[in-house]
């Protein structure tokens, strides 16, 4: 079974800068899985942001404009990254990655 680790406990960024979060997949080939990213804002329910499937197809949350969240995966390091562009106060949240084994 696959295991996920998010090595960064926290990330502090200046407004308008870029934040890059990592999710390390072990126990399964990342190219054979779909990785999902979610966020939980204080006092709110968890929300789907973006996913990348085994074939590299990306799907985003309909209500968030393109260009805000960018997901990728690096097979060499078995890592998925979530890049948050133009960081704003409303991006303050806890971000989770999840795995769907194909």
């Amino acid at each position: 079974a696959g295991h996920l680790e998010q090595p960064q406990i926290s990330s502090t960024k200046t407004l308008s800068k870029t934040a890059r979060l990592e999710c390390v997949v072990s126990g399964i080939t990342i190219s054979a899985t779909s990785v999902y990213w979610y966020r939980e804002r204080p006092g709110e329910v968890i929300q789907f942001l973006v996913s990348i499937s085994y074939d590299g197809t990306v799907r985003k949350e309909s209500g968030i404009p393109s260009g805000k969240f960018e997901v990728d995966r690096i097979p060499e390091t078995s890592t998925s990254t979530l890049t948050i562009h133009n960081v704003e106060k409303q991006d303050i949240a806890t971000y989770y990655c999840a795995l769907w084994e194909v």
């Epitope: 990348i52 590299g56 949350e61 309909s62 960018e70 990728d72």
Partner: antibody, heavy 118, light 108 residues
Framework: EVQLVESGGGLVKPGGSLRLSCAAS????????MNWVRQAPGKGLEWVSS????????FYADSVKGRFTISRDNAKNSLYLQMNSLRAEDTAVYYC???????????WGQGTLVTVSS | EIVLTQSPGTLSLSPGERATLSCRAS???????LAWYQQKPGQAPRLLIY???NRATDIPDRFSGTGSGTDFTLTISRLEPEDFAVYYC?????????FGGGTKVEIK
């Protein structure tokens, strides 16, 4: 059937203002991010602005930042672009487009022509 | 800002021929964030390809997209009369979203 219909274009003098509208139908408008893209006569496409479903995320091209304001009214299934301090280089056909969940803009309106000239 | 450069500017081909259109990015773009559009005179653009190899709804399989990093290609395997148009690439991985300058595919 998904439909996007722009209106509000016309002839305006440099320094003037104009408000474009985009009426959406055939889908749940309140769920989707929306965009404005323009095309100057005989030229290519230029992204202008985008807005999230709840208006929380808003982005602008540098060329219009501080002059244009994007907004939406989910109750009226409408997208807007308030254009102030218009310049000759803003002359273009303005299209509204829906953000596709899987990338790109999957539906576009027919466009509305904005001409800025004295 | 990611600048996309399309080449050639104009491609003169006959129906039935293969068309190969190039889109080069000024910095690396994830292949998952590149799209192609077709635009005919007096019409709005139409989404053809996203991601960069997924065909949009109702797009025939003669259209295909490939590429990674900074180099992307749209291929039309056999040109049909209705394929003569202008084609644009777009990156949507980061704001500002940007389009290439376009390639016009015209009848030879």
């Amino acid at each position: 059937e998904v439909q996007l219909v722009e209106s509000g274009g016309g002839l305006v003098k440099p320094g003037g203002s104009l408000r474009l509208s985009c009426a959406a139908s055939g889908f749940t408008f309140s769920v989707y991010s929306m965009n404005w893209v323009r095309q100057a006569p005989g030229k290519g496409l230029e992204w202008v602005s985008s807005i999230g479903s709840s208006s929380s995320y808003i982005f602008y091209a540098d060329s219009v930042k501080g002059r244009f304001t994007i907004s939406r009214d989910n109750a009226k299934n409408s997208l807007y672009l308030q254009m102030n301090s218009l310049r000759a280089e803003d002359t273009a056909v303005y299209y509204c487009g829906r953000d596709h969940d899987y990338g790109g803009l999957d539906y576009w309106g027919q466009g509305t022509l904005v001409t800025v000239s004295s | 800002e990611i600048v996309l450069t399309q080449s050639p500017g104009t491609l003169s081909l006959s129906p039935g021929e293969r068309a190969t259109l190039s889109c080069r990015a000024s910095q690396s773009v994830s292949s998952s964030y590149l799209a192609w559009y077709q635009q005919k005179p007096g019409q709005a653009p139409r989404l053809l390809i996203y991601g960069p190899s997924n065909r949009a709804t109702d797009i025939p399989d003669r259209f295909s997209g490939t590429g990674s990093g900074t180099d992307f290609t749209l291929t039309i395997s056999r040109l049909e009369p209705e394929d003569f148009a202008v084609y644009y690439c777009q990156q949507y991985g980061r704001s500002p979203l940007t389009f290439g300058g376009g390639t016009k595919v015209e009848i030879k």
